[in-house]
Interface confidence: medium
């Protein structure tokens, strides 16, 4: 039978590191906490897209806090050669697009998307929530952006920023993009509350994108998705104060803060400044 046929067909992971989707806490503001110590720490600044120094008071605060610049970069910028995406100007897909889907060993059963190299399309699969590989996207759009051939040979990132084919630069200030690539805050903020599969009843908050507010829900203790915060404040930080405004179809994306045009690399899920 088919199971016996598969006995010797084992899907092996590749040299690439596993996918870790951009963490919600990388979008949190630096939080020095209520204590009075003076401790040099680093946080990821979503506006400059760089890891920067701040003074931490020594208690509480949030998870966007790292002991070293390297740790911060490793966690929030993914500045890693294996993860840098070759743009479609060279008509190349990143290597991880060719990996088989990998559910991982855990039992979260989260809907994710992977690029199927046989059908040349992004398809849905169930991810367990841990381990796995990089061919794993939270939304169909993300998967298409990264692994399917984009329109006109452009690689379009999730912030609606388009690569300029002439000078290899990005213009994030005011870019017309197809409605498919509209930005509505971090992708997990758009997902519904997900209790998960276990039996606990923990008080958590999720961002309700319909009403634009953080609301409480009961979390089971395992699985679920990233739209899951231990406090309303954390929820608001991550989702309510999205740094790119909502837009109507065909409209312009405008950042809330002006930024200088920067030469950047296109990379999975994020824009990275060179030589950070």
């Amino acid at each position: 039978d088919s199971e016996e046929d598969e006995e010797h067909t084992i899907i092996t992971d590749t040299e690439l590191p596993p996918l870790k989707l951009m963490h919600s806490f990388c979008a949190f503001k630096a939080d020095d906490g209520p204590c009075k110590a003076i401790m040099k720490r680093f946080f990821f600044n979503i506006f400059t897209r760089q890891c920067e120094e701040f003074i931490y008071g020594g208690c509480e605060g949030n998870q966007n806090r790292f002991e070293s610049l390297e740790e911060c970069k490793k966690m929030c910028t993914r500045d890693n050669a294996n993860r840098i995406i070759k743009t479609t100007l060279q008509q190349e897909k990143p290597d991880f697009c060719f990996l088989e889907e990998d559910p991982g060993i855990c039992r979260g059963y989260i809907t994710r998307y992977f690029y199927n190299n046989q059908t040349k399309q992004c398809e849905r699969f169930k991810y367990g929530g841990c381990l796995g590989n990089m061919n794993n996207f939270e939304t169909l759009e993300e998967c298409k952006n990264i692994c399917e051939d984009g329109p006109n040979g452009f690689q379009v990132d999730n912030y609606g920023t388009q690569l300029n084919a002439v000078n290899n630069s990005l213009t994030p200030q005011s870019t017309k993009v197809p409605s498919l690539f509209e930005f509505h805050g971090p992708s997990w903020c758009l997902t519904p509350a997900d209790r998960g599969l276990c039996r606990a009843n923990e008080n958590r908050f999720y961002y309700n994108s319909v009403i634009g507010k953080c609301r409480p829900f009961k979390y089971s203790g395992c699985g679920g998705n990233e739209n899951n915060f231990t406090s309303k404040q954390e929820c608001l930080r991550a989702c309510k104060k999205g740094f790119i405004q909502r837009i109507s179809k065909g409209g312009l994306i405008k950042t809330k803060r002006k930024r200088k045009k920067q030469r950047v690399k296109i990379a999975y899920e994020e824009i990275f400044v060179k030589n950070m």
Partner: antibody, heavy 121, light 108 residues
Framework: QVQLQQSGPGLVKPSQTLSLTCAIS??????????WGWIRQSPGRGLEWLGF?????????SYAVSVKSRITINPDTSKNQFSLQLNSVTPEDTAVYYC???????????WGQGTLVTVSS | DIVLTQSPATLSLSPGERATLSCRAS???????LAWYQQKPGQAPRLLIY???SRATGVPARFSGSGSGTDFTLTISSLEPEDFATYYC?????????FGQGTKVEIK
């Protein structure tokens, strides 16, 4: 209660292949809710995860980069066991090797008794 | 790889005392996927805590786990003679799964 019973030689010559087997009772190697892995422990390196195999819609495996070019973990559904093969061993591969069941949400909840493998000529 | 650093390396306490063991990750780890193990000489590790705070089957209530992000703690509220052992944390959030170097709890 899941039980894991390890078997295999305790002495392997350098450049040869280390082979260990882990027999499972109380669960199935094809279980949809677990992974079956190998961990080793040596004074110099502590506990080191080597890799595991697991079945969902098909078989998958995942290996530590440090041994990736040399390791194979295979299931044997007919005997309800899984095996470790580590090629081209050196004295640095001397360690106590454990097989373990990694629960889908709950850590490594069952372990084999451990096998001290010495790599020496 | 995610590096887990346990502290202290050795903890010298008397029976009845409270033990607090720390596990710090080099990157944030989902609290769903952090486990603690106990190991005695000549034995395989034994799962104590999974999901950072859930006790495994048969583990006494004096063992508790807490933490999130990069900082996790195993607490033994009142040490029993059989608790003197080495304790390891493990993350299975990101490939490869990694272990801490261990904390030995010894009798003072």
């Amino acid at each position: 209660q899941v039980q894991l019973q390890q078997s295999g030689p305790g002495l392997v010559k350098p450049s040869q292949t280390l082979s260990l087997t882990c027999a499972i009772s109380g669960d199935s190697v094809s279980s949809n809710g677990a992974a079956w892995g190998w961990i080793r422990q040596s004074p110099g390196r502590g506990l080191e995860w080597l890799g595991f195999i697991y079945r969902r819609s098909k078989w998958y495996n995942s290996y530590a980069v440090s041994v990736k070019s040399r390791i194979t973990i295979n299931p044997d559904t007919s005997k309800n066991q899984f095996s470790l093969q580590l090629n081209s061993v050196t004295p640095e591969d001397t360690a106590v090797y454990y097989c373990a069941r990694q629960d889908g949400m709950g850590g490594m909840d069952s372990w084999g008794q451990g096998t001290l493998v010495t790599v020496s000529s | 790889d995610i590096v887990l650093t346990q502290s202290p390396a050795t903890l010298s306490l008397s029976p009845g005392e409270r033990a607090t063991l720390s596990c710090r990750a080099s990157q944030s780890v989902s609290s769903f996927y952090l486990a603690w193990y106990q190991q005695k000489p000549g034995q395989a590790p034994r799962l104590l805590i999974y999901g950072s705070s859930s006790r495994a089957t048969g583990v006494p209530a004096r063992f508790s786990g807490s933490g999130s992000g990069t900082d996790f703690t195993l607490t033994i509220s009142s040490l029993e003679p059989e608790d003197f052992a080495t304790y390891y944390c493990q993350q299975y959030d990101s490939t490869p799964s990694t272990f801490g170097q261990g904390t030995k709890v010894e009798i003072k």
